[in-house]
């Protein structure tokens, strides 16, 4: 009986990531007696809510309850009933809701109020719904990946958790790409963070970290595409937009009113002599890349060096984990392997974008056309953002690791958010950690 594990004493937490294009629910699980250990919390389930992001419910807030039902019911099933009342639920909304709030605090509040009312109806310990800042989004993503990689652990391990783990305590930088914003977060080497807005100080497990972070609102892949279209239609001679970022033969009609709905296109807004225009794909990577570069203003920098749009960026340092849409897009394009050089990625993108739309549709018959049509743009955008936006080079490209999951947990801001709100990351290193009951001695 000595080796028989006792019933597990576990705790659960739920975080909903209310992104610009969709909402995902994550369930986290950890041994109760090891709350302050590093790396013990892991994701036990994920549920993707069917439908768009919550910011799209402005005109139909009465549908929010139904929208959240399936995933909340799945959470109810996944967590033992005895634990429901002790399970905290957090909802964090990101850039899609930041943009809605920019247009109208009233509309953003209304959506969040209905979300809160809906989530309060479940038997969990609902802790509130809020719009997190871009700085938080970057910081929590950085905490998540480094927590999962064991970078905060003082115990040096002789084994590697994941193939790209360097066996030292140097933290990974975090690169997060969403639909409406993108974040870059890392510890610069002996570099003063010249802009106070981009500086974070953490003390985690007895170690101090001076972290650089910036969130580029409107530079997520979907809003970047809207920006590009708004910029390009300005100089179109008629209501046909020949677009190198879409496959040859691809056609799509866009409403001008939809184009100018977002604050992201405000700088390109103009009175056009038509209400609609047609995108006609010509599939040219190089031209697409050039068009995307025009979204990055590099002519002005009030610091020693900048990313773009006058935003301070210290010299890149160490390894980076690139997750969320960085991973999903590159995974689709089969470009996540550690062995694929930047030159090879560029070469593959050139070929992919040049493929005729009819051929692409046949090759990827199971993929929704709306998503399928945008991979050429998204892949090109990722390359442009990383190389010209963040100044990665062909050499430093090898330090970018496209990560979906680490140890079964999704890379993203949600785990870091929950660890922080449940006070599970101590400032000081715990003195000793008791063995759990189920450990074999």
């Amino acid at each position: 009986t000595q080796n028989k594990a006792l019933p597990e004493n576990v705790k659960y937490g739920i975080v909903l990531d209310a992104g610009s294009s969709h909402t995902s629910l994550y369930i986290y699980k950890w041994p109760a007696e090891k709350e302050n250990d590093t790396g013990v919390v892991h994701q036990s389930a994920e549920c993707r809510v069917k439908g768009p992001g919550i910011s799209k419910f402005v005109q139909k807030v009465n549908e929010i309850g139904i929208y959240l039902t399936d995933c909340m019911e799945a959470a109810r099933e996944a967590i033992p009933r005895s634990q429901h009342q002790e399970t905290p639920v957090y909802l964090g909304a990101t850039a899609g809701m930041r943009l809605l709030r920019m247009e109208s605090e009233e509309l953003a509040d209304r959506v969040l109020d209905v979300v809160e009312r809906s989530l309060s109806n479940y038997p969990f310990d609902f802790q509130g719904a809020r719009i997190i800042t871009g700085q938080e989004e970057g910081a929590y993503g950085w905490i998540t990946i480094n927590y999962l990689l064991g970078k905060f652990s003082q115990k040096t391990r002789w084994f590697s958790i994941v193939p790209y783990e360097t066996n030292n305590q140097e933290t990974f930088g975090a690169l997060d790409l969403g639909g409406a914003s993108t974040q870059v977060t890392f510890v610069p080497q002996n570099q003063t963070i010249e802009s106070p807005d981009n500086a974070l100080q953490f003390r985690l497990y007895g170690k101090d970290y001076n972290v650089y972070t910036h969130s580029f609102l409107c530079y997520g892949k979907d809003q970047a595409l809207w920006q590009k279209l708004a910029k390009d239609i300005q100089v179109a001679s008629n209501e046909i937009l020949r677009d190198p970022c879409f496959h040859p033969g691809y056609k799509k009609v866009v409403n001008v009113s939809d184009l100018y709905k977002t604050p992201c296109t405000k700088r390109f807004e103009m009175t056009l002599p038509f209400q609609q225009f047609e995108i006609q794909g010509i599939g040219n990577y190089q031209q697409c890349h050039q068009s995307i570069l025009e979204l990055f203003n590099t002519s002005y920098c009030p610091y020693s060096q900048c990313a773009f749009n006058g935003i301070f960026l210290p010299p890149l340092q160490g390894d980076f984990g690139a997750f969320s849409a960085f991973y999903f897009v590159m995974k689709f394009l089969n470009l996540t392997s550690e062995k694929v050089s930047q030159e090879k990625v560029t070469e593959m993108m050139k070929k992919f974008c040049a493929q005729p739309w009819e051929e692409i549709k046949t090759s990827y018959a199971g993929v929704k056309e709306k998503y399928l049509s945008e991979y050429c743009f998204s892949g090109t955008y990722i390359l442009s953002l990383l190389l010209q936006g963040y100044h990665f080079t062909a050499d430093s490209w090898e330090h970018i690791h496209f990560i979906g999951k680490i140890q079964g947990s999704d890379a993203g801001w949600t785990l870091g958010y929950m660890l922080n709100l449940t006070n599970m990351i101590p400032a000081e290193q715990p003195l000793s950690t008791p063995l759990s009951h189920s450990t074999y001695v």
Epitope: R110, L217, P263
Partner: antibody
Amino acid sequence: EVQLQQSGPELVKPGASVKMSCKASGYTFTDYNMHWVKQSHGRTLEWIGYIVPLNGGSTFNQKFKGRATLTVNTSSRTAYMELRSLTSEDSAAYYCARGGTRFAYWGQGTLVTVSA
Amino acid sequence: DIVLTQSPASLAVSLGQRATISCRASESVDNFGVSFMYWFQQKPGQPPNLLIYGASNQGSGVPARFRGSGSGTDFSLNIHPMEADDTAMYFCQQTKEVPYTFGGGTKLEIK
């Protein structure tokens, strides 16, 4: 705590221009629009327009279009308004206010006097 | 443009009594189930201070004696009980559509 600090009073001649500033602190500058409001005779409030600090795009009240220019410097977290071809009608207090549709935070105002 | 007509232009109310200020819009200021109507208080030499947003929600730190109501085109601000510190100018504002507009103001004094 959110604060908007405006530049000091201005005495300008008719036909000249004036450029005033509004320095923001206590929040992410690029997450909210900055509006400008004119108040004449301590009573009439008129909305001039707003700028999206994120990208410099702006929207104006037709009455001020062409004569008012809104700009921002994101690194110094400052919004600016320039008014050109001033007349005595432009003598007023000018306020910056943060908001999308809710003007919850206002600067203390810049008093502009147009006089020969 | 949406015109906001505020009444009365001036009002004198005894301490402890109720002050009611009305604001009528030339067209509905409701959209997506929200009333884009706001009330501000302004004291001499100070910027306007947000009292009520979304027609009926109290601004941060605003005393409970300030109440906003109404929807569509007809709105009102109630102050009860009236206190000495409430002597000020009061303005309504709509942000349903550009150009955003303000009412002409109501001067509230103690009787």
